[in-house]
């Protein structure tokens, strides 16, 4: 985050830029930017192997939740969206691409079908989905 | 928008950030930006007049949809919330808060109450609605 | 505390149809699946199929697909299981099981009293 | 549909032995895979889930293992109220398919 006042006294400008005001950055292009994580909601019906491979064309993940707090942005989302959660058969755990463990109390987690993936909906909820399935998805991306 | 070379040659730093990522702003803090608008989704219920309020508190007003492409995330919103879009009854007219005319074919009007205001809700719809209702609201702030 | 309750003992007629309920209680009915398992009369357990509950959505194990409708209603948080075309070997205690998918929560982990619905003419 | 052969059928043991009761799958089904136990006149009790998960509430004298396709139940030390019927379930694909039961009797 370029803080306003760093930016003013370096550029000279008589723009006022309250201090409160920041940047949020840097993203792709075109890209939702939000407490510094770049987020983007992609249209078109792709199956979860397909989603991945198109987030990560693009120097991101699958979404990623993290953060109640730091992403309550995703409160309002409408629809399902493949999320970056799979299933690890081999040890029963549910797990982001980065191979961290989903914590506890993050997301309702619903049983909507048999899969190894899930989709992201609304008000941090989870539906579990064959990872076949086509459905849009939400690519990620963290700031450094 | 800081475009990433300029910033890399200005501060002479190492760090490489693609030519297609974008600083957006400046937005006030914790809010989203988008194609360099800022917006802030509010979890508490005030009538139309409070909201507005509550956004000039803010230097910003309430959401004004004025470009299918450039605000296509309104595209996903879950739920009812007040825009600054009201019924100007001396001419029939829906405006803007800023007094300009409402474009055609930018939102699907729907009558669910007798009101003088709007609410948005996903896929570009207004929902006409007394503008007493207590509402969650969306607050708008343009960049320069 | 979590509870599946059942509805009482049916005696049908072959041809006839029979509907059991299952009645959920102390936990948020949408979340978990909801599986529907027979015994026969000193036989072993059998899988018939299970229901979304979030999505209406059924799953039927083959061997009942056509003649079973699984249904749930989440404004009273019960579960329906409908069989038609009931023959002689239909006669079994019904069991209603919590889970659907056993991806993320525990198989039928809990599970209704049963309810016996013997086919005789 | 998988085949789930649950062996031995019966079983005769005495209060204090370790007992073992094997499923074997007639494909792969990763972990997915349950151990119930069944008394008279009541509804199965889910035991062990994923294959070697301890159910919250269930007495740590009970665990499970894979080996492939062979599962395996195993009781370290028979309490009387372990005397009951137990069944193996494959949750991996459609139909999903228990085995035949196996019954623990007193010796």
């Known amino acids: 985050i370029w803080s306003a006042v760093f930016l003013n006294s370096l550029f000279n400008q008589e723009v006022q830029i309250p201090l409160t005001e920041s940047y949020c950055g840097p993203c792709p292009k075109n890209w939702i930017c939000y407490k510094n994580n770049c987020y983007q909601f992609f249209d078109e019906s792709k199956n979860w192997y397909e989603s991945q491979a198109s987030c990560m064309s693009q120097n991101a993940s699958l979404l990623k939740v993290y953060s109640k707090e730091d992403q309550d942005l995703l409160k309002l989302v409408k629809s399902y969206h493949w999320m970056g959660l799979v299933h690890i058969p081999t040890n029963g755990s549910w797990q982001w691409e980065d191979g961290s463990i989903l914590s506890p109390n993050l997301l309702t987690i619903i049983e909507m079908q048999k899969g190894d993936c899930a989709l992201y909906a609304s008000s941090f909820k989870g539906y579990i989905e064959n990872c076949s399935t086509p459905n849009t998805y939400i690519c990620m991306q963290r700031t450094v | 928008i800081w475009s990433a070379v300029f910033l890399n040659s200005l501060f002479n730093q190492e760090v490489q950030i693609p030519l297609t990522e974008s600083y957006c702003g400046p937005c006030p803090k914790n809010w989203i930006c988008y194609k360099n608008n800022c917006y802030q989704f509010f979890d508490e219920s005030k009538n139309w007049y409070e909201s507005q309020a509550s956004c000039m508190s803010q230097n910003a007003s309430l959401l004004k949809v004025y470009s299918k492409e450039d605000q296509d995330l309104l595209k996903l919103v879950k739920s009812y919330h007040w825009m600054g879009l009201v019924h100007i009854p001396t001419n029939g007219s829906w405006q803007w808060e800023d007094g300009s005319i409402l474009s055609p074919n930018l939102l699907t009007i729907i009558e669910m109450q007798k009101g003088d205001c709007a609410l948005y809700a996903s896929s570009f719809k207004g929902y006409i609605e007394n503008c007493s209702t207590p509402n969650t609201y969306i607050c708008m702030q343009r960049t320069v | 505390q979590v509870q599946l309750q059942q509805s009482g003992t049916e005696v049908k007629k072959p041809g006839a149809s029979v509907k059991v309920s299952c009645k959920a209680s102390?936990?948020?009915?949408?979340?978990?699946?909801l599986t529907w398992i027979r015994q026969a009369p000193g036989q072993g357990l059998e899988w018939m199929g299970w229901i979304s509950v979030f999505n209406g959505s059924p799953n039927y194990s083959l061997k009942f697909q056509g003649r079973v409708t699984m249904t749930a209603d989440t404004f009273t948080n019960t579960a329906y299981m409908e069989l038609r075309s009931l023959r002689s070997d239909d006669t079994a205690v019904y069991y209603c099981a919590r889970g659907g998918t056993g991806d993320y929560y525990p198989l039928f982990d809990y599970w209704g009293q049963g309810t016996l619905v013997t086919v005789s003419s | 549909a998988i085949r789930m052969t649950q062996s031995p059928s019966s079983l005769s043991a005495s209060v204090g032995d370790r007992v073992t009761i094997t499923c074997r799958a007639s494909q792969g089904i990763r972990n997915d895979l349950g151990w119930y136990q069944q008394k008279p006149g009541k509804a199965p009790k889910l035991l062990i889930f994923?294959?070697?998960n301890l159910e919250s509430g269930v007495p740590s004298r009970f665990s499970g293992s894979r080996f492939g396709t062979d599962f395996t139940l195993t009781i370290s030390s028979l309490q009387p109220e372990d005397f009951a019927t137990y069944y193996c379930?494959?949750?991996?694909?459609?139909?999903?398919?228990f085995g035949q039961g196996t019954k623990l009797e007193i010796k």
């Open positions: 102390g936990y948020t009915f949408t979340t978990y699946g």
């Open positions: 379930l494959q949750d991996y694909n459609y139909p999903y398919t």
């Open positions: 994923a294959a070697s």
